[in-house]
């Protein structure tokens, strides 16, 4: 649900953080209409996620942890 | 409706480990969190840490994070907490609460009753 | 020391209007939204409003919140007696300490 390399709606699914290698934060004031995190998966798929969903937090969160500790 | 049974008092010594369990019944399993918060006596809540069972992978506040194993079993559809090296000021009532991880909001909507944990020196 | 700072107590007599606290930071309130929570002595906490204003269903609509900026608010009118209880904030947290953190409770007394 891009274009333009911005998202325009979220994924209905919830995806297993196996499958996701990092993300990019995308903010509706700089340029597209809305917030969204785009989960970069090992398959090269960029998935637009909703930022405010628990398991999009904590995917995060745990992607955020792992550069910390590199 | 959604329930969640959490196993009954512990009395531990300081040193030793204890193991406190949450049982979720009336709903599937797969869109669910489970933290566990614990309250002190005449203390706030403070969050020890928590799991999504799907992912299989758990997550701890930093000041638990080298003490605590929050750990799944999707078949019996329990989530545990276990506390290491205890100290007295662990004596806390250890609860499990519930968020729905597919929600754009991050409440827990349903509680357990509360584990007591108490630590003896 | 809680990362969200609450007034330890508040009152207020039948009928009133009572607004408790709560204050954070820009990486928790500031860019998260707010989760209130009702203890009654001796019970598990109860969700009482979740996404800074929102109800679930069952809680009175005395029972509203709000949030602008770094701070948030839980307000009760015409407070009733069985209202007495401690009442926390709490938010997800973008730090890595900890994911949700909590307000230190405020003690509602019912005079």
């Known amino acids: 649900a891009s274009n333009f390399d911005c998202c325009l709606g979220y994924t209905d699914r919830i995806l297993h953080p196996k499958f996701i290698v990092g993300f990019t934060r995308q903010l509706a004031n700089e340029g597209c209409d809305i917030n969204a995190i785009i989960f970069h998966t090992k398959k090269k798929l960029s998935v637009c996620a909703n930022p405010k969903q628990t398991w999009v937090k904590y995917i995060v969160r745990l992607l955020s942890k792992k550069v910390k500790n590199m | 409706q959604v329930q969640l049974q959490q196993s009954g008092a512990e009395v531990k010594k300081a040193g030793s480990s204890v193991k406190v369990s949450c049982k979720a019944s009336g709903d599937t399993f797969s869109n669910f969190a489970i933290s566990w918060v614990r309250q002190a006596p005449g203390h706030g809540l403070e969050w020890v840490g928590g799991i999504i069972p799907v992912f299989n992978t758990a997550d701890y506040a930093q000041n638990f994070t080298d003490r605590v194993t929050i750990s799944a079993d999707k078949a019996t559809k329990t989530v545990y907490m276990e506390l290491h090296s205890l100290r007295s000021d662990d004596t806390a009532v250890y609860f499990c609460?519930?968020?729905?991880?597919?929600?754009?909001?991050?409440?827990?909507?349903?509680w357990g009753r509360g584990t007591l944990v108490t630590v003896s020196s | 020391q809680s990362v969200l700072t609450q007034p330890p107590s508040a009152s207020g007599t039948p009928g009133q209007r009572v607004t408790i606290s709560c204050s954070g930071s820009s990486s928790n309130i500031g860019s998260n939204t707010v989760n209130w929570y009702q203890q009654l002595p001796g019970t598990a906490p109860k969700l009482l409003i979740y996404s800074n204003n929102q109800r679930p269903s069952g809680v009175p609509d005395r029972f509203s919140g709000s949030k602008s900026g770094t701070s948030a608010s839980l307000a009760i009118s015409g407070l009733q007696s069985e209202d007495e209880a401690d009442y926390y904030c709490?938010?997800?947290?973008?730090?890595?300490?900890?994911?949700?953190?909590f307000g230190g409770g405020t003690k509602l007394t019912v005079l």
């Open positions: 709490a938010a997800w947290d973008d730090s890595l300490n900890g994911p949700v953190v």
């Open positions: 609460a519930r968020t729905k991880i597919e929600l754009d909001n991050d409440a827990f909507d349903i």
